[in-house]
């Protein structure tokens, strides 16, 4: 089914307008901002969600060290251009004709330029590192319990195939979730790791995109997991192209 039939809402995307005007009177939902039809049985693409958001009123070491090419989304919100499939267009420009290239999760991967800037292809983000710091608890979490709970979360809540959760690392109080998905691995119908990471980020920030509750509160074997901060690193299949000036 496309959406919840009983009251015609989109369980996986609250930033939609739904009406029973689909084939045979079925409930059909369109994303705010773009008006594109969305499949409510899975996650909506990050590009359409950002567009909707902008249109809405208002050694023994086990932790991963992000690679020198890892990107962090420092630019924040912008109103993106999405292709007909809801993916980010490789080149994004603002209203003052400043343009830049983005990766498949919409994060800038080049210096900003003008309208002459070329972005030949949409470069895929194939590795995402979600870095969480949790608040003090009654005791350290058991690593295997934590691993199982986070894998369950990504499988059940975000519908991400388990093979794309590459690892869960834990060194109290830091938790790292590694998501990996190469172009060749992603089959039709598979949730994109970028979309799953975005839904997770919004959940942690108490801004759930799912219909219903405002956020996501995790517990591991009954123990409340209260997140103190979240950092997300993005690794692309082709390293980003920034001038040396930005790196100093």
């Amino acid at each position: 089914h496309t959406a919840a039939q009983d009251n015609c809402t989109c369980p996986t995307n609250k930033m939609t307008v739904c009406s029973p005007d689909g084939p045979g009177g079925r409930c059909q939902c369109r994303a705010l901002g773009s008006g594109m039809a969305v499949d409510c049985s899975t996650l909506t693409s990050k590009c359409l969600l950002l567009k909707a958001r902008m249109s809405a009123p208002k050694n023994a070491r086990t932790l991963v060290r992000p690679s020198e090419h890892a990107l962090v989304d420092n630019d924040g919100l912008y109103d993106p251009d999405c292709d007909p499939e809801g993916r980010f267009k490789a080149r994004q420009c603002n209203q003052t004709s400043v343009c830049w290239c983005v990766n498949s999760v919409g994060v800038r991967r080049t210096d900003k330029g003008d309208l002459s800037l070329r972005c030949d292809e949409l470069v895929r983000t194939h590795h995402i590192l979600i870095d969480l710091r949790h608040r003090p608890t009654a005791g350290a979490f058991n690593h295997s319990d934590l691993d199982a709970e986070l894998r369950r979360l990504f499988r059940e809540r975000y519908r991400l195939h388990p093979k794309f959760v590459a690892a869960v690392h834990y060194e109290q109080p830091t938790i790292q979730i590694e998501l990996r998905q190469n172009t060749s691995q992603k089959a039709a119908g598979d949730v994109d790791i970028g979309d799953a990471a975005y839904y997770f980020e919004r959940d942690i920030k108490g801004e759930s995109l799912f219909q219903g509750r405002g956020g996501l509160d995790l517990r591991v074997r009954g123990e409340p997991l209260q997140v103190e901060r979240t950092l997300i690193y993005y690794l692309d299949e082709i390293p980003p192209k920034f001038s040396m000036k930005r790196l100093t």
Epitope: G139, G206, S208, E223
Partner: antibody
Framework: QIQLVQSGPELVKPGASVKMSCKAS????????IHWVKQKPGQGLEWIGY????????KYNEKFKGKATLISDKSSTTAYMEVRGLTSEDSAVYYC????????????WGQGTSVTVSS | DIQMTQSPSSFSVSLGDSVTITCKAS??????LAWYQQKPGNAPRLLIS???SLETGVPSRFSGGGSGKEYTLSITSLQNEDVATYYC????????FGGGTKLEIK
């Protein structure tokens, strides 16, 4: 249905200790922590701490460290709180509470145990 | 520790009126906010969690709003049974309650 049933009122002398209970039923006891909350007469609510019955791990509000001790007994699905070195400041109603199934808010509450400290 | 400041501390209202209670956190609590209703001699009752989500069985005249550090509880068309003390509580960093707002009928 889910229930938290607390022990009856207590009248105790200054300097003594008191131990109250909170019997949980209607759900798997080890799946949720049990919180304890204090309410002095005519005043607001104050979080004391929680115990995780799964592993007996405890977390306390700094203010209540050394004052309250939380324990649990899986076999009887009961949580206990002992308050020691009682003074008039400890005269209050003490509630146990269980979190909501989806959030860390407190969804199910015991009826409260009234403690009066008086010589 | 996160401080929760609730205002006003008391409210005198007429039946059928609307009322809004405000709760301010000392830092961003990312919508990890609950509202409770407590009647004399009773335990608190959870009305709203996640800042806006109404719990099962809570009348629709209650609603929660806000984000960041500032949150509100609104009650429209006040009924006799709404006379109580209302508390906000943050659960982003441990658990802290606001001082309470006592609702009385004029």
């Amino acid at each position: 249905q889910i229930q938290l049933v607390q022990s009856g009122p207590e009248l105790v002398k200054p300097g003594a200790s008191v131990k109250m209970s909170c019997k949980a039923s209607g759900y798997t006891f080890t799946t949720y922590v049990i919180h304890w909350v204090k309410q002095k007469p005519g005043q607001g609510l104050e979080w004391i701490g929680y115990i995780n019955p799964n592993n007996d791990g405890t977390k306390y509000n700094e203010k209540f460290k050394g004052k309250a001790t939380l324990i649990s007994d899986k076999s009887s699905t009961t949580a206990y709180m002992e308050v020691r070195g009682l003074t008039s400041e400890d005269s209050a109603v003490y509630y146990c509470a269980r979190p909501h199934f989806e959030t860390h808010a407190m969804d199910y509450w015991g009826q409260g145990t009234s403690v009066t400290v008086s010589s | 520790d996160i401080q929760m400041t609730q205002s006003p501390s008391s409210f005198s209202v007429s039946l059928g009126d609307s009322v809004t209670i405000t709760c301010k956190a000392s830092e961003d609590i990312f919508n990890r906010l609950a509202w409770y209703q407590q009647k004399p001699g009773n335990a608190p009752r959870l009305l709203i969690s996640g800042a806006t989500s109404l719990e099962t069985g809570v009348p629709s005249r209650f609603s929660g709003g806000g984000s960041g550090k500032e949150y509100t509880l609104s009650i429209t068309s006040l009924q006799n049974e709404d006379v109580a003390t209302y508390y906000c509580q943050q659960y982003w960093n441990t658990w802290t309650f606001g001082g309470g707002t006592k609702l009385e009928i004029k």
